[in-house]
């Protein structure tokens, strides 16, 4: 603000964020992932930080465990509000398997197609939720090579609550986690102790989202 | 269009190694959209997965065979290869290579290899 | 080790009949996963179908495929001379892949 109070330049605030993006979050509903509540808070707090519309930011979203559901298409909804009831509504699918390869090339495939409400010309992200190594996780290098083909951007979180509350070494599920991040890592990564946690990362994680289009 | 050619020794002796190489053409091996692999048929039955490559190097083995099989990839010859060490008369089989994206959808015509002394 | 188990291992059928295959797995394969394979006497398998139901490239529609779970099945709505051949299921989902023993589809 100058001497004379006039406005010399302004910062939008992250969360006013009215960039053009197709995100489509793919979340794994397997049986393993507990709490639910903790996923739709984290996809609450995620979304309310968006501006959501036709000429803005689009989302949609995919659940996927043995089988892969599309919960909502990238133009089903055209306000923030509306995106936020739908998310809320969502319901665990579950399924004995994690098939993670399988959800994100379903979205690759199918979530971001003009028929569903992807833009041309328009940045397509990926958010990839998981808390577990995939059973197919064998097919994992050509989903993400398909991935970086189509120029989709994508960040993973890694869920760590089953293993630590099993004591297990999240070694191995880490390193898988981080394989299906863009690069670089480091920015596209995320793991969180348990489900719980995922409300803290939010906050970085629509900075980097929002950051794609600066 | 894309074609494979399997090709390699056709008698191999009881402790050896098999060597076989699959050469692709019409296309490239290095297009990361496929895993390349060897299958194989014993006589008069069905068929079994050994394993396969991504471009990069990465593998993916059958547990049943996987202490006996190496697969690899030369992007540069547009080949990939199977060695499989330590054959019985069990190992006695046609061996395919096939191209795999959704499903295997190019195969070699395949080649017979009989371990015999 | 998904498990697949085809039946009946031989269909005795005349052209022009239709031919339902079975294809069940052990454990629930996910329908994005399995495809199908022809194969005649002397020859590499031939890819018929994809996610359980999409006909590959130059395959006929005569050719069909449904299923979901554990059960899946292929049906040739009227068979042509060439269909008599080995059919095999395929799931590739979980490691190792696997395939079925086959179906046999002969000439009666």
């Known amino acids: 603000v100058s001497p004379t109070f006039q406005v010399v330049n302004s910062i939008a605030p992250v969360q006013e964020c009215s960039t053009q993006l197709d995100i489509v979050i793919v979340l794994d509903g397997s049986n393993s992932i507990y709490p639910w509540d903790s996923v739709t808070a984290f996809l609450n707090d995620l979304l309310e930080r968006m501006d959501i519309g036709p000429k803005q930011t689009q989302v949609g979203i995919v659940q996927y465990g043995e089988n892969v559901t599309h919960e909502f298409n990238l133009n089903k909804y055209s306000s923030t509000e509306e995106v936020l009831v739908a998310a809320n509504k969502i319901v665990q699918r579950g399924g004995r398997q994690t098939m993670t390869a399988l959800g994100i090339d379903t979205a690759r495939k199918e979530a971001f197609t003009e028929a569903r409400g992807a833009r041309r010309g328009v940045k397509k992200v990926m958010v990839i939720v998981t808390d577990g190594e995939s059973h197919d996780n064998h097919r994992l290098k050509k989903v993400i090579q398909d991935c970086e083909d189509e120029n989709i951007q994508r960040f993973s979180i890694a869920i760590l609550g089953s293993y630590n509350r099993g004591n297990l070494s999240t070694e191995k599920f880490v390193e898988e986690i981080k394989s299906i991040a863009s690069e670089p890592t480091e920015k596209h990564f995320f793991n969180v102790s348990d489900e719980l946690a995922l409300v803290t990362i939010v906050k970085t994680l629509g900075e980097r989202i929002f950051a794609l289009e600066a | 269009q894309v074609q494979l050619q399997e090709s390699g020794p056709g008698l191999v002796k009881p402790s050896q190694t098999l060597s076989l190489t699959c050469t692709v053409s019409?296309?490239?091996?290095?297009?990361?959209?496929?895993?390349w692999s060897w299958i194989r048929q014993h006589p008069g039955k069905g068929l079994e997965w050994i394993g396969y490559?991504?471009?990069?190097?990465?593998?993916y083995y059958n547990p049943s065979l996987k202490s006996r099989v190496t697969i690899s990839v030369d992007t540069s010859k547009n080949q990939f290869s199977l060695k499989l060490s330590s054959v019985t008369a069990a190992d006695t089989a046609v061996y395919y290579c096939?191209?795999?994206?959704?499903?295997?959808?190019?195969w070699g015509q395949g080649t017979t290899v009989t371990v015999s002394s | 080790e998904i498990v697949l188990t085809q039946s009946p291992g031989t269909l005795s059928l005349s052209p022009g009949e239709r031919a339902t295959l079975s294809c069940r797995a052990s454990?629930?394969?996910?329908?994005?996963?399995l495809v199908w394979y022809q194969q005649k006497p002397g020859q590499a398998p031939r890819l018929l179908l994809y996610d359980a139901s999409s006909r590959a490239t130059g395959i006929p529609d005569r050719f069909s495929g449904s299923g979901s779970g554990t059960d899946f099945t292929l049906t040739i709505s009227r068979l042509e001379p060439e269909d008599f051949a080995v059919y095999y299921c395929?799931?590739?989902?979980?490691?190792?892949?696997?395939f079925g023993g086959g179906t046999k589809v002969e000439i009666k």
């Open positions: 096939a191209r795999d994206g959704y499903g295997m959808d190019v």
């Open positions: 490559i991504f471009y990069s190097g990465s593998t």
């Open positions: 395929q799931q590739y989902g979980n490691s190792p892949l696997t």
């Open positions: 019409g296309g490239s091996i290095s297009r990361g959209n496929y895993y």
């Open positions: 454990q629930s394969v996910s329908s994005s996963y």
